[in-house]
């Protein structure tokens, strides 16, 4: 039997059953999430669930830029340090950098400080690049 690899939307890349779209547009976290949803296919800001997934994404993004942080789908909606993925994925894999998570920083970004392999919390109103994800 021939198993066809699913195709992603133009400009998105495929990895292990998921499609990812990296957008070098400036959005606050909630606008970024709504834009991801607008692309259909059940897309959301990306959940990152393993080191392998993180490494693949980081390698891809590093081909475009190495200095701008990028919103991902991890947030703290109750503002109680109870982090959850916006797409409903289980929050098991963690890759926080050592930076403080205090103040009003209730949305997560991939940090450029460690080649996008670690996360930092940031203020959700900040305008930043963002990463979307869906399962084709």
């Amino acid at each position: 039997d021939i198993i066809m690899r699913p195709s992603c939307a133009p400009g998105w890349f495929y990895h292990k059953s998921n499609c990812y779209g990296y957008f070098r547009k400036l959005r606050n976290w909630s606008d970024a999430e709504l834009e991801c949803q607008s692309y259909g296919n059940g897309a959301h800001l990306a959940s990152i669930l393993s080191l392998k997934e993180a490494s693949t994404i980081a390698e891809y993004i590093s081909g475009y830029q190495r200095s701008q942080p990028i919103w991902i789908g991890l947030h703290d909606p109750q503002k109680r340090q109870q982090w959850q993925w916006i797409d409903g994925a289980m929050y098991l894999y963690r890759s926080w950098s050592g930076k403080s998570m205090g103040g009003n920083k209730h949305c997560a970004e991939m940090s450029s400080n460690n080649n996008f392999l670690t996360w930092s919390s940031n203020e959700c109103n900040k305008r930043q690049h963002f990463l979307c994800k869906y399962r084709p």
């Epitope: 606050n28 909630s30 103040g103 009003n104 203020e123 959700c124 109103n125 305008r127």
Partner: antibody, heavy 118, light 109 residues
Framework: QVQLQESGPGLVKPSETLSLTCTVS??????????WGWIRQPPGKGLEWIGS???????DYNPSLKSRASISVDTYQNQVSLKLTSVTAADTAVYYC??????????WGRGTLVTVSS | YVLTQPPSASETPGQRVTISCSGS????????VYWYQQLPGTAPKLLIY???QRPSGVPDRFSGSKSGTSASLAISGLRSEDEADYYC???????????FGTGTKVTVL
């Protein structure tokens, strides 16, 4: 209830630097996690975004004004400042400050008229 | 100005008036559109956010919509207090900044 009040000289000479201050009450700049923007409106004309500064100090500017505009925050005095260098008569306008949530402006200050004339 | 609006619009009380806002894929098509009302001699006030949402206190006579690179604001049941300038606005991805429309003066006849 957040309120914004612009202040500064109403008259500036050509080639000089326009300096305005926006005092924020009802919110703490250091804890609010917002951008704070400046928008201007020449008499009888439309609105033009000058730029916005995040409370931490990083700023975005209108490309057409980027070389002349500088926006900064003073979290101790709860103020946002605008400096516009090398002004001409075309910079005569009502200058507004507004809170910017990364998506839109709300609320706005009442505005202050700055006239550039010798 | 990157966003284009008609300079004026007028209608009699109780009628409906629609204001258009034309842009591009860099702003309106892939960004949210916002509308501001500026009553004579006052600062602008947010009227519509995220294309079609009304802040609390804004009557449901005001409605926003968007299709492709154009947006529109409709005012139904027009009243004399609606006489004002109306501006559309959006983030522009090519400029990395906000852009405003040229503004439309609404007159209630």
């Amino acid at each position: 209830q957040v309120q914004l009040q612009e202040s500064g000289p109403g008259l500036v000479k050509p080639s000089e630097t326009l300096s305005l201050t926006c005092t924020v009450s009802g919110d703490s700049l250091s804890r609010s996690s917002y951008y704070w923007g400046w928008i201007r409106q020449p008499p009888g004309k439309g609105l033009e975004w000058i730029g916005s500064v995040f409370y931490s100090g990083s700023a975005d500017y209108n490309p057409s004004l980027k070389s002349r505009a500088s926006i900064s925050v003073d979290t101790y005095q709860n103020q946002v400042s605008l400096k516009l260098t090398s002004v001409t008569a075309a910079d005569t306008a009502v200058y507004y400050c507004a809170r910017d949530d990364g998506s839109t402006f709300d609320p706005w200050g009442r505005g202050t008229l700055v006239t550039v004339s010798s | 100005y990157v966003l284009t609006q008609p300079p004026s619009a007028s209608e009699t009380p109780g009628q409906r008036v629609t204001i258009s806002c034309s842009g591009s894929s860099a702003n309106i098509e892939y960004n949210f559109v916002y509308w501001y009302q500026q009553l004579p001699g006052t600062a602008p006030k947010l009227l519509i956010y995220r294309n079609n949402q009304r802040p609390s206190g804004v009557p449901d006579r005001f409605s926003g919509s968007k299709s492709g690179t154009s947006a529109s604001l409709a005012i139904s049941g027009l009243r004399s207090e609606d006489e004002a300038d109306y501006y559309c606005a959006a983030w522009d991805d090519s400029l990395n900044g906000y852009v405003f429309g040229t503004g439309t003066k609404v007159t209630v006849l």
